[in-house]
Amino acid sequence: APVPPGEDSKDVAAPHRQPLTSSERIDKQIRYILDGISALRKETCNKSNMCESSKEALAENNLNLPKMAEKDGCFQSGFNEETCLVKIITGLLEFEVYLEYLQNRFESSEEQARAVQMSTKVLIQFLQKKAKNLDAITTPDPTTNASLLTKLQAQNQWLQDMTTHLILRSFKEFLQSSLRALRQM
């Protein structure tokens, strides 16, 4: 399992550490979550052939996973710090229901799935502090999330496996795009 952020998981600027800065905490947190996703993806890919499947598009149509687009201002072309930060936080909040869905989807990596979920909650808190002046952040509706969760859990086995694979892949891509953009803030 990856080392929790704040422990010796990464090169540090000095042997006697000052408390982590806000940007360093965020950076470490994202990398920690990405390590967790890699471990979960390994189990998913070993367990089924979803990672090589060409039928992803069929399942993807039923999911509304957050995705970075040009208009979000998180790419090098048209980078906009405020717009991008709102998108990152909003996207992470939208991912929470999907991370909840993942909780009963793993056998040997059950703890890892929980760690990814909890670490994402912490990351959202870090980012909300950074964006304290931004009021454009919308929180997903709990009722909508509850019915989505029920719908996902009612899928057949094949679709559940595919959904798990797609959530992990999309979350990894979203976090990598976020990490790239946050380096410019």
Partner: antibody
């Protein structure tokens, strides 16, 4: 005009140490991540290390981790690379570069480091 | 680490030719690729970022395309100043890695 200028390259014996410097001008240095990249003769560039704008986030390539140390002084608009336990395969042109979204949009002209007995 | 493999290692062409250089990533990196041009005795110069975005000041005859693991740099009509070595670089994640280069020579 945006400019990066490296200095400190030299001929050094195996096991020796060297400190490279990079002076920046023409842009707001404290706003950018900065990196060191080297290129051995006839080879492609090799990324070595990146430091965040405030100096709190540092990454190293496995090939230099534990031997090289990156640092910066925003007041002086300078970037540094402290190199220890140098080996012959560390011989290369060392470039300082400005990183933007994991690519490098501004490069210095480079400084030559030769490790030989 | 993500390995970037360029092909061909060298190519000969004439002024006015259309030239395409290829780069393959060892894993899916979406469109996070940069392309550089390097002339002898000079530092690399950024041409393309994010797979297809032209860096400011770079002539429009240079273009980039591709996503996932396969990428291309195209020079639509070679000019004398374009003879140089070209490198791809994955800008997806650290450790940042470069291709081994493609040398563009005069035929």
């Amino acid at each position: 005009q945006v400019n990066l200028r490296e200095s400190g390259g030299d001929l050094v014996k195996p096991g020796g140490s060297l400190r490279l410097s990079c002076a920046a001008s023409g842009f707001t240095f404290r706003k950018y991540y900065m990196a060191w990249i080297r290129q051995a003769p006839g080879k492609g560039p090799e990324w070595l290390s990146t430091i965040s704008n405030s100096g709190d986030i540092i990454d190293y390539a496995d090939s230099v981790r534990g031997r090289f140390s990156i640092s910066r002084d925003n007041a002086q608009k300078s970037l540094y690379l402290q190199m220890t336990s140098l080996r012959p395969d560390d011989s290369a042109i060392y470039y300082c570069a400005r990183e933007y979204f994991f690519s490098f949009d501004v490069w210095g002209r480079g400084t030559m480091v030769t490790v030989s007995s | 680490d993500i390995v970037m493999t360029q092909s061909p290692s060298s190519v000969s062409a004439s002024v006015g030719d259309r030239v395409t250089i290829f780069c393959r990533a060892s894993q899916d990196i979406r469109n996070w690729v940069a392309w550089y041009q390097q002339k002898p005795g000079e530092a690399p110069k950024l041409l393309i970022y994010d797979g297809s975005s032209l860096q400011s000041g770079v002539p429009s005859r240079f273009s980039g395309s591709g996503s996932g693991t396969e990428f291309t740099l195209t020079i639509s009509s070679l000019q004398p100043e374009d003879f140089a070595t070209y490198y791809c670089q994955q800008s997806d994640s650290t450790p940042i890695t470069f291709g081994q280069g493609t040398r563009l020579e005069i035929k």
